[in-house]
Interface confidence: low
């Protein structure tokens, strides 16, 4: 066959679907690779062809669209499974072509099993709720396009294994689940099961997401530098190791970039000649507040190093702060015998 623009295997779109449930998969060509949509392509006389490679096989095969009850079908740029089977797992290719043009892309589809409590190897989206922030909602994801608006599905919500009924602060409202006041105890996996009829059959869509309760913007503050502070003096003799921790607390802020850095005499450590190393560690609270520690280390400090200015800086979307460390050279202890002798007038 003639040359075809091959976009390869698009592993960025690792599609996972549950076994024995409907799945609708759009050809990624129009969403991510081409500068026109399916309608434009179709009206220009281009044809969309689907084929697949089974798991652990190298052979590309056409997709069988003549299965009983139209189990697999194509509608415009969507490949439909009604429903999926475990052995539908494989790499699927959609190819757009006519006599002069050809473009194709492959993507992996994994059909996964779930247990009675919705546990599975499915990668779960994470939805963050602010702690004690008033009513917040999550919506049953990725159910658009499965049934027409005239169909009224039934939706059942679960937290972990348990149907959400008579929960104190969590109320199912159709496709939405409302949290009256989110608390740490609301952390967990939430599943909506959408049941709808189609051509005399009943289908189920299972969607699970992880809820993580995080710090509220109402409580957010600019970065707080716990160390260095005014109470600790780093007193060293030349030749000793100088270790100064910079410990900074950051309130959780959605999409904020938290930064900590040191300056020595106003310059970044990379821009000066002294042999300095910086080690960083990060820890998080249950509400994803962050504590960053950067330890500045000079293995063998010189008397010049002990005269420099060491400043810890921190920045978040809430503001920027800085704090200088108190560094000084240790005064040598008096040589006791000599001073004693001098005190008695000895020469």
């Amino acid at each position: 066959s003639e040359r075809c623009d091959d976009w390869g295997l698009d592993t960025m779109r690792q599609i996972q679907v549950f076994e024995d449930e409907p799945a609708r998969i759009k050809c990624p060509l129009f969403e991510h690779f081409l500068k026109f949509n399916y309608s434009t392509a179709h009206s220009a006389g281009l044809t969309l062809i689907w084929y697949w490679t089974r798991q652990d096989r190298d052979l590309e095969e056409p997709i069988n669209f003549r299965l009983p009850e139209n189990r697999i079908s194509k509608e415009k740029d969507v490949l439909w499974f009604r429903p999926t089977l475990l052995n539908d797992t494989g790499n699927y290719t959609c190819m757009l072509r006519n006599t002069t043009y050809c473009s194709k892309v492959a993507f992996p589809l994994e059909v996964v099993q779930k247990d009675s409590c919705f546990n599975s190897p499915m990668k779960l989206p994470v939805h963050k709720l602010y702690i004690e922030y008033g009513i917040q909602r999550i919506t049953c994801p990725n159910v658009d396009g499965y049934f027409p608006s005239s169909v009224k599905p039934t939706i059942t919500w679960y937290m972990g294994c348990y149907k959400i009924q008579n929960f104190n602060n969590v109320i199912p409202e159709g496709m939405n689940l409302s949290f009256l006041i989110a608390l740490i105890s609301n952390n967990g996996n939430y599943t909506c099961v959408v049941t709808y009829p189609e051509n005399g059959r009943t289908f189920h869509l299972t969607r699970t997401l992880t809820v993580k309760v995080v710090g509220s913007p109402k409580n957010a503050v600019p970065p707080v530098i716990h160390s260095p502070n005014d109470h600790v003096v780093y007193e060293k003799e030349p030749g000793e190791e100088l270790l100064i921790p910079c410990t900074v607390y950051f309130s959780f802020l959605m999409d904020s970039r938290n930064e900590v850095w040191w300056t020595i005499d106003g310059k970044k450590p990379d821009d000066i000649t002294i042999d300095v190393t910086i080690n960083e560690s990060i820890s998080h609270s249950r509400t994803e507040d962050e504590t960053r520690t950067q330890i500045l280390s000079i293995k063998k400090v010189t008397s010049e190093d002990l005269k420099r200015s060491y400043v810890c800086h921190a920045r978040s979307a809430k503001g920027e702060v800085a704090k200088a460390a108190k560094v000084k050279q240790k005064v040598p202890a008096p040589r006791y015998t000599v001073e004693l002798a001098c005190g008695f007038g000895a020469t």
């Epitope: 247990d115 409590c117 190897p121």
Partner: antibody
Framework: EVQLEESGGDLVQPGASLRLSCAAS?????????MCWVRQAPGKGLEWVAC????????IYYATWAKGRFTISKASSTTLYLQMNSLRAEDTAVYFC?????????????WGQGTLVTVSS | DIVMTQSPSSLSASVGDRVTITCQAS????????LSWYQQKPGQAPKLLIY???TLASGVPSRFSGSGSGTDFTLTISSLQPEDFATYYC?????????????FGGGTKVVIK
């Protein structure tokens, strides 16, 4: 040849910590593999410890007795760990790593040869 | 806690004998059939014989068979061979949220009469 190999077993004192590793060769864990640790005390039966879905970081399960002291984790598509803290004499056992492929309910079709952990003062 | 009770705990048999081992779970296994059987010889790792209560694992001789559903299961060796003298374990899989995911039976040691 497809195999799992455990390492890290040792003689330690009560209260100590130990990290066991399980390295896969000839395969890498697929996202639907259920990777587990199972132990066997000398002369006794098999006892489940913990499991993790290879394709997930949230689907982690522990035996009731192991919660809090033992941590299962996965470093890559070929390495599984078991971090054991506050070890007790009754944790003395051969620790096996085992894989259940592609589906729940299919049993553990691949086992390592085991690594011996002895907790004694 | 889930308990898997295997019986007998040991049995003496001769080559050619038909051997039956039972396994009872204190609650139904997931999907009524998520039960596996293993064979273990001294100093070796367990070997999968049967999964999904009755499906023979790859490479396992057809003299081994499994049956049962829910809480009661049976492993049968139709004609015991010299290499079959070993310890046999059942293993159930359960809903991970309400209980331990996995539990093993105490084992049945098959020895030469």
């Amino acid at each position: 040849e497809v195999q799992l190999e455990e390492s890290g077993g040792d003689l330690v004192q009560p209260g100590a910590s130990l990290r066991l590793s399980c390295a896969a060769s000839g395969i890498s864990f697929s996202s639907s593999d259920f990777m587990c640790w199972v132990r066997q005390a000398p002369g006794k039966g098999l006892e489940w410890v913990a499991c993790i879905y290879a394709g997930s970081s949230v689907s982690i399960y522990y035996a009731t007795w192991a919660k809090g002291r033992f941590t299962i984790s996965k470093a890559s598509s070929t390495t599984l760990y078991l971090q054991m803290n506050s070890l007790r004499a009754e944790d003395t056992a051969v620790y096996f790593c085992a894989r259940s492929t592609g589906s729940v309910g299919r049993g553990f079709n691949l086992w390592g040869q085991g690594t011996l952990v002895t907790v004694s003062s | 806690d889930i308990v898997m009770t295997q019986s007998p705990s040991s049995l003496s048999a001769s080559v050619g004998d038909r051997v039956t081992i039972t396994c009872q779970a204190s609650q139904s296994v997931y999907n009524s059939n998520h039960l596996s059987w293993y064979q273990q010889k001294p100093g070796q790792a367990p070997k999968l014989l049967i999964y999904s209560a009755s499906t023979l694992a790859s490479g396992v001789p057809s003299r081994f068979s499994g049956s049962g559903s829910g809480t009661d299961f049976t492993l049968t060796i139709s004609s015991l061979q010299p290499e079959d003298f070993a310890t046999y374990y059942c293993q159930g899989e359960f809903s991970c949220v309400s209980a331990d995911c996995i539990a093993f039976g105490g084992g049945t040691k098959v020895v030469i009469k």
